[in-house]
């Protein structure tokens, strides 16, 4: 007998063909021999089976000898052997209906686990193979688990259920609730305005929650809450903000913070957390602020950076249009008795300039 796989909630068409291409008597029955549908004269009649309100046939194809049965809104319990009786012959079709669902909300926080559960008819022994949007392959039986969701797991998961050499494909949309970046660093000269942006890696129709930015200044012994805010239907409202620094926050998404001035005492790293309504856990984004200052004091030209820098970053001082006068993998460089002219302080990573500050050295007579 023919095996057909169906998806819960979908529509399936079970085919039955007569040898003669003409309208003739036919019946579809279930394994209990209870009539589902059939033809009486020119009319489709329905029997009292459980499929009575969900089964139909393409009347337009009857005169071509095609007597298919269409079952809408498939349920797992529709799995059965169906019998088509036409021209004194019986055709059997085994229908197996499967369902694949995420057994929690499909909107999950980064780091949370995802479990996909397969609903299958009794006596079946299917296998499941799922592919994440990022190309990760996971196999399983009745359940498939992804222990720690990553940002790149957001999107459509494609799962293939196999049974009796037949396959049926499910697509499940998973939204990983996270910020677009796990970490970002802002490089600023002393005195410049600082813009921090925290774009989300997802969109929700209604986005409600609350958040806070904790800041650990390099010079401070402990961290401090710089700002707390509420999010209601994508509208941001500040609850509490420190006096120093006095941060400003944008009213719309993406979350946007402005620090009026980059000062060495603010250099450090922060952690923005966002707790979403009806979700356990929080979204996190780390943000770093590196501040540069170039000063001339008596015969000493100094360039310093504060904040979290990697040891491989290079700090250089050079006179304009000349090679580097001094260059170190350090947080401060200086030149004694500098030549007059425009000096550049550069913070670079493998030749790529991250931050530069110019200072004019005037001749001393």
């Amino acid at each position: 007998k023919k095996v057909v796989l169906g998806k819960k909630g979908d529509t399936v068409e079970l085919t039955c063909n007569a040898s003669q291409k003409k309208n003739t008597q036919f019946h579809w029955k279930n394994s209990n021999q209870i009539k589902i549908l059939g033809i009486q004269g020119l009319f489709l009649t329905k029997g009292p089976s459980k499929l009575s309100d969900r089964a139909d046939s393409r009347k337009s194809l009857w005169d071509q000898g095609c007597f298919s049965m269409i079952i809408k809104n498939l349920k797992i319990e529709d799995s059965d052997t169906y019998i088509c009786e036409v021209e004194n012959k019986k055709e059997e079709v085994e229908l197996l209906v499967f369902g694949l669902t995420a057994n929690s909300d499909t909107h999950l926080l980064e780091g949370q686990s995802l479990t996909l559960t397969l609903e299958s008819p009794p006596g079946s022994s299917p296998s499941v193979k799922c592919r994440s949007p990022g190309g990760k392959n996971i196999q399983g039986g009745r359940t498939i688990s992804v222990p720690q969701l990553e940002r790149q797991d957001s999107g459509t998961w494609t799962c293939t259920v196999s049974q009796d050499q037949k396959t049926v494909e499910f697509k499940i949309d998973i939204v990983v609730l996270a910020f677009q970046k796990a970490s970002s660093t802002v490089y600023k000269k002393e005195g410049e305005q600082v813009e921090f942006s925290f774009p989300l890696a997802f969109t929700l129709e209604k986005l409600t929650g609350s958040g806070e930015l904790w800041w650990q200044a390099e010079r401070a012994s402990s961290s401090k809450s710089w700002i707390t805010f509420d999010l209601k239907n994508k509208e941001v409202s500040v609850k509490r903000v420190t006096q120093d620094p006095k941060l400003q926050m944008g009213k719309k998404l993406p979350l946007h913070l402005t620090l009026p001035q980059a000062l060495p005492q603010y250099a450090g790293s922060g952690n923005l957390t966002l707790a979403l309504e009806a979700k356990t856990g929080k979204l996190h984004q780390e943000v770093n602020l590196v501040v540069m200052r170039a000063t001339q004091f008596q015969e000493n030209l100094t360039c310093e950076v504060w904040g979290p820098t990697s040891p491989k970053l290079t700090l250089s001082l050079k006179l304009e249009n000349k090679g580097a006068t001094v260059s170190k993998q350090a947080k401060a460089v200086w030149v004694l008795n500098p030549e007059a002219g425009m000096w550049q302080c550069l913070l670079s990573d493998s030749g790529q300039v991250l931050l530069e500050s110019n200072i004019k050295v005037v001749p001393t007579w």
């Epitope: 209990n32 209870i34 009539k35 059939g38 009486q40 009649t45 029997g47 009292p48 309100d53 349920k75």
Partner: antibody
Framework: QVQLQESDPGLVKPSETLSLTCTVS????????WSWIRQPAGKGLEWIGR???????NYNPSLKSRVTMSVDTSKNQFSLKLSSVTAADTAVYYC??????????????WGQGTTVTVSS | DIQMTQSPSSLSASVGDRVTITCQAS??????LNWYQQKPGKAPNLLIY???NLETGVPSRFSGSGSGTDFTFTISSLQPEDIAAYYC?????????FGQGTRLEIK
């Protein structure tokens, strides 16, 4: 064993809506169709329609425009509403369980019936 | 809808008699026919399903036969407790329909 009990609406006025509830005890309402059948005094049986535990329904075309059936699985009850009643709707109303088996489809458990009189 | 015609509409018989009731369907219903017994003031009770199969717990004096459009219900030896109305019911197609009933009384 499974028992069915129809509610008693008593007297219903013409043009009003008749409401009946059938309570299932000694078993679950799930996985079965449940029918309503009526019988005017001294006459035969008329099938009104049926409802499945999931809420899907089939109604007798002769009454379809006036019939609404619903199910409450949490209370193990199913209900019938018949609108715009007339004296012709006066009858004993039965609820019954429909059971399917191999070549078998029958109403194997019935309520004791409730008399509904339509009169002003 | 499928019409079910029962005959006779009433009959009188003696205890021990063989009693036969017929039921005719307006179209072919294969073997999708039930027979019910309804005692006065009570709900109907399923006796026979699929034209000829005895429901569990039903005495063997009751039997049924037929297929297609013509069906027969028989009580081989009438007992006093068999006084009731008997109904045929088709379950080939929706809506489910009943015969108009046969009233059986004892002479």
């Amino acid at each position: 064993q499974v028992q069915l009990q129809e509610s008693d609406p008593g007297l219903v006025k013409p043009s009003e809506t008749l409401s009946l509830t059938c309570t299932v005890s000694g078993g679950s309402i799930s996985s079965y169709y449940w029918s309503w059948i009526r019988q005017p005094a001294g006459k035969g049986l008329e099938w009104i329609g049926r409802i499945y535990a999931s809420g899907s329904t089939n109604y007798n075309p002769s009454l379809k425009s006036r019939v609404t059936m619903s199910v409450d699985t949490s209370k193990n009850q199913f209900s019938l509403k018949l609108s715009s009643v007339t004296a012709a709707d006066t009858a004993v109303y039965y609820c019954a369980r429909d059971r399917e088996g191999y070549y078998y489809y029958g109403m194997d458990v019935w309520g004791q019936g409730t008399t509904v009189t339509v009169s002003s | 809808d499928i019409q079910m015609t029962q005959s006779p509409s009433s009959l009188s018989a003696s205890v021990g008699d063989r009693v036969t009731i017929t039921c005719q369907a307006s179209q072919d219903i294969s073997k999708y026919l039930n027979w019910y017994q309804q005692k006065p003031g009570k709900a109907p009770n399923l006796l026979i399903y699929a034209a000829s199969n005895l429901e569990t717990g039903v005495p063997s004096r009751f039997s049924g036969s037929g297929s297609g459009t013509d069906f027969t219900f028989t009580i081989s030896s009438l007992q006093p407790e068999d006084i009731a109305a008997y109904y045929c019911q088709q379950y080939d197609s929706l809506p489910i329909t009943f015969g108009q009933g046969t009233r059986l009384e004892i002479k």
